[in-house]
């Protein structure tokens, strides 16, 4: 039996700059029941606070609701482990909510097969930013990627689309069914998960009244 090992805060994420969660790895428990607490202070303040919500984001986590989240302040966060034999603390982690945003995937992915005047066909991929993202006001600047592949293929073909929420893909195989997904990344944050797959079959012979 021994004091607990050093815990480690291994991830903090915000879906929208308005709330965030931090998760920790507990470290060894020293063979004894061990209690964990997350404490934090804010840039320029002496006061130390305890995690407002240990439940919402699951085990070994702390959820900061809107009431506790500010993008104007750096959070200095520590996890403390305590058992009968002693205690240990993680290294303090400095968290700027601007830099931990991982948004929800884009929505409304639509696929349309189109034809140019020269009879060349292409796939027109369109989508919308994630629901919570206030892109219009510049609160978020979002970049996007799409990926697609024939249904049976292993490898995805990835296209970076910048800030565009539509993209035209040329030179696809007639008669093939393609799977398409999209994802987004805010200017300083992390890529979202890939969206749910949409699929489209490229026609063998294409005639369109445009």
């Amino acid at each position: 039996q021994s004091p607990p090992g050093k815990p480690e805060i291994h991830k903090c994420r915000s879906p929208d700059k308005e709330t965030f969660t931090c998760w920790w790895n507990p470290g060894t428990d020293g063979g004894l029941p061990t209690n964990y607490s997350l404490t934090y202070s804010k840039e320029g303040e002496k006061t130390t606070y305890e995690c407002p919500d240990y439940k919402t984001s699951g085990p070994n986590s702390c959820f900061f609701s809107k009431q506790y989240t500010s993008i104007w302040k750096i959070y200095i966060i520590t996890v403390n482990a305590t058992n009968q034999m002693g205690s240990s603390s993680s290294d303090p982690l400095y968290v700027d909510v601007t830099y931990i945003v991982e948004p929800e995937p884009p929505r409304n992915l639509t696929l349309e097969v189109k034809q140019l005047k020269d009879k060349k066909t292409y796939l027109w991929v369109k989508w919308s930013p994630p629901t919570i993202t206030d892109v219009k006001t510049g609160w978020f600047t979002m970049e996007y990627e799409i990926r697609l592949k024939p249904e049976e293929a292993e490898e995805w073909e990835i296209h970076f689309t910048g800030h565009q929420t539509q993209f035209k893909v040329f030179d696809l195989y007639p008669g093939q069914k393609y799977l398409v997904q999209t994802r987004c990344k805010p200017d300083h944050g992390y890529w979202s998960r890939w969206s749910q797959e949409s699929s489209v079959e490229m026609p063998n012979d294409f005639t369109l009244k445009d």
């Epitope: 790895n25 400095y94 700027d96």
Partner: antibody
């Protein structure tokens, strides 16, 4: 505790390439972005670029695009920077540096001195 | 790119004196989120740089309170109230509001 280990020095020929390593320990490697910084002898610091080890997303200083390539090996918790077409201008100390979830450098490697010489 | 200009280049001081280093940026350093990402690092001889001050005026963990930062917009200052021998080295200001992140040329604090 967090450590970033870099080899002390590399001597390389002009026109060749070199791949510098930065072995991370004491934290979850894929959780934090890794930056690279250049320091020429007796001069200031230049930010080269950053890589997110969780998905290998990179962002480069325009000045170093084509010169530096950042990669990671998550199985060994090691970040790499390859420098190509080396000239005497590339002779410098190169640091890897980790931020927290912030945009400054909290932890630094000891730096690798690259000397480009015929 | 944002150019960071530090003055003086060299600052000879006596131990116990106050030291002041200036840093001027070629663009305002207020980020779109309202924060000002101006930081100060100290590089001691033969070592890698260490963070002293983040976001203009916040001392990093373990940094003595004789170090203080101030400023706004494009003009920033680092002050050391009573210089100690362990403070000697090269001080760099750095901005991370605009990509690419850039550094000042450094100010060498040395004993008079």
């Amino acid at each position: 505790q967090v450590q970033l280990q870099q080899p002390g020095a590399e001597l390389v020929r002009p026109g060749t390439s070199v791949k510098l390593s930065c072995k991370a320990s004491g934290y979850t490697f894929t959780s934090f972005w890794m930056h690279w910084v250049k320091q020429r002898p007796g001069q200031g610091l230049e930010w080269i670029g950053v890589i997110d080890p969780s998905d290998t997303y990179t962002n480069y200083n325009q000045k170093f695009k084509g010169k530096a390539t950042l990669t990671v090996d998550t199985s060994s918790s090691t970040a790499y920077m390859q420098l190509s077409s080396l000239t005497s201008e590339d002779s410098a100390v190169y640091y890897c540096a980790r931020g927290d979830y912030s945009n400054w450098f909290t932890y630094w490697g000891q730096g690798t001195l690259v000397t480009v010489s015929a | 790119d944002v150019v960071m200009t530090q003055t003086p280049l060299s600052l000879p001081v006596s131990l116990g004196d106050q030291a002041s280093i200036s840093c001027r940026s070629s663009q305002r350093l207020v980020h779109s989120n309202g924060n000002t990402y101006l930081h100060w690092y100290l590089q001691k001889p033969g070592q890698s740089p260490k963070l002293l001050i983040y976001k203009v005026s916040n001392r990093f963990s373990g940094v003595p309170d004789r170090f203080s930062g101030s400023g706004s917009g494009t003009d920033f200052t680092l002050k050391i109230s009573r210089v100690e021998a362990e403070d000697l080295g090269v001080y760099f200001c750095s901005q991370s509001t605009h990509v690419p992140w850039t550094f000042g040329g450094g100010t060498k604090l040395e004993i008079k």
